[in-house]
């Protein structure tokens, strides 16, 4: 089930790469965030809390990522035209309960000016 397109700027371009921003509500304490390209899982990041509120971050499909208190950023490098596609942030919320899943996304357009190694 697709909850809709992201209502924020999901793609931030810099230095021939792109930062894909996956937001989640401040209230969320434990979750898994997956970055999907089409239907394929590219990256994931899981945040859980153990006893004594120790935070654990795990990735099964590792990408360069960055976690903040309300977003996960995934970074893709060396952009080329094959990167153009629909990308989705698939958020599974474990805490607060009950378990919930939301899917938001958008289309990544690749323009010449954003490619990694342009011929001058």
């Amino acid at each position: 089930e697709i909850n809709g397109s992201a209502n924020y700027e999901m793609f931030i371009f810099h230095n021939g790469g792109v930062q894909i921003l996956c937001k989640y509500p401040d209230i969320v304490q434990q979750f898994k965030m997956q970055l999907l390209k089409g239907g394929q899982i590219l990256c994931d990041l899981t945040k859980t809390k153990g006893s004594g509120n120790t935070v654990s971050i795990k990735s099964l499909k590792f990408c360069h990522s960055q976690l903040s208190n309300n977003s996960v950023s995934f970074f893709l490098y060396n952009l080329d035209h094959s990167h153009a596609n629909y990308y989705f942030c698939n958020l599974s919320i474990f805490d607060p309960p009950p378990f919930k899943v939301t899917l938001t996304g958008g289309y990544l357009h690749i323009y010449e000016s954003q490619l990694c190694c342009q011929l001058k």
Partner: antibody, heavy 122, light 106 residues
């Protein structure tokens, strides 16, 4: 058919204890998160406690935290609520309930038991 | 904690009427809202989930709408079996029920 049957409700004195049980049938109990929800006489519904399918994740309402303990036995298709240090305000019908899920996770409570009555009074 | 406020508390209506019940959340809950029907001495029944999805087996005269903080349950044409109390429930963060709306015969 899908069914939840509660038992264990009784009249108990303040400070006393009670153990509620719920037996599930007609579905794969071990696949579902379960809840206890209560309803005081003539009042609305109040969520009490929640347990994950494997029993490793548990949550309680603030009003019962530290006094009530939820547990389950998947081999016996059973859900339990151990109620200690009971107070007059715990008087209610207690419902065992199944937390429904679908592709987007929870969709609320889709199966309820008939309820069991707990009365706390001296 | 998220508070849920239903209005009206009591609603008098006749068979065939279009009935609307409102539920307001104290903060945004996206679409994580369910509606239940309860008859005296019985357990509640799930009617609507995710704010607007009709539960299997629930009559199609029931519909839900809204997102964020404002939600409505509509009964398009009230039937004799619909006189009952209706509760909204948020499940965005834990679970909170509204205080209920009793639909009675006018």
């Amino acid at each position: 058919q899908v069914q939840l049957v509660e038992s264990g409700g009784d009249l108990v004195k303040p400070g006393g204890s009670l153990r509620l049980s719920c037996t599930a049938s007609g579905f794969t109990f071990s696949d579902y998160y379960m809840d206890w929800i209560r309803q005081a006489p003539g009042k609305g519904l109040e969520w009490v406690s929640y347990i994950s399918s494997s029993g490793d994740t548990i949550y309680y309402a603030d009003s019962v935290k530290g006094r009530f303990t939820i547990s389950r036995d998947n081999a016996k298709n059973s859900l339990f609520l151990q109620m200690d240090s009971l107070r007059a305000e715990d008087t209610a019908v207690y419902y065992c309930a199944r937390d429904a899920h679908y592709v987007s996770g929870s969709k609320g409570v889709d199966v309820w038991g008939q309820g069991t009555t707990v009365t706390v009074s001296s | 904690d998220i508070q849920m406020t239903q209005s009206p508390s009591t609603l008098s209506a006749s068979v065939g009427d279009r009935v609307t019940i409102t539920c307001r959340a104290s903060q945004s809950i996206s679409s994580w809202l369910a509606w239940y029907q309860q008859k005296p001495g019985k357990a509640p029944k799930l009617l609507i989930y995710k704010a607007s999805s009709l539960e299997s087996g629930a009559p199609s005269r029931f519909s839900g709408s809204g997102s964020g903080t404002q939600f409505t349950l509509t009964i398009s044409s009230l039937q004799p079996d619909d006189f009952a109390t209706y509760y909204c429930q948020q499940y965005y963060s834990y679970w909170t029920f509204g205080q209920g709306t009793k639909v009675e015969i006018k």
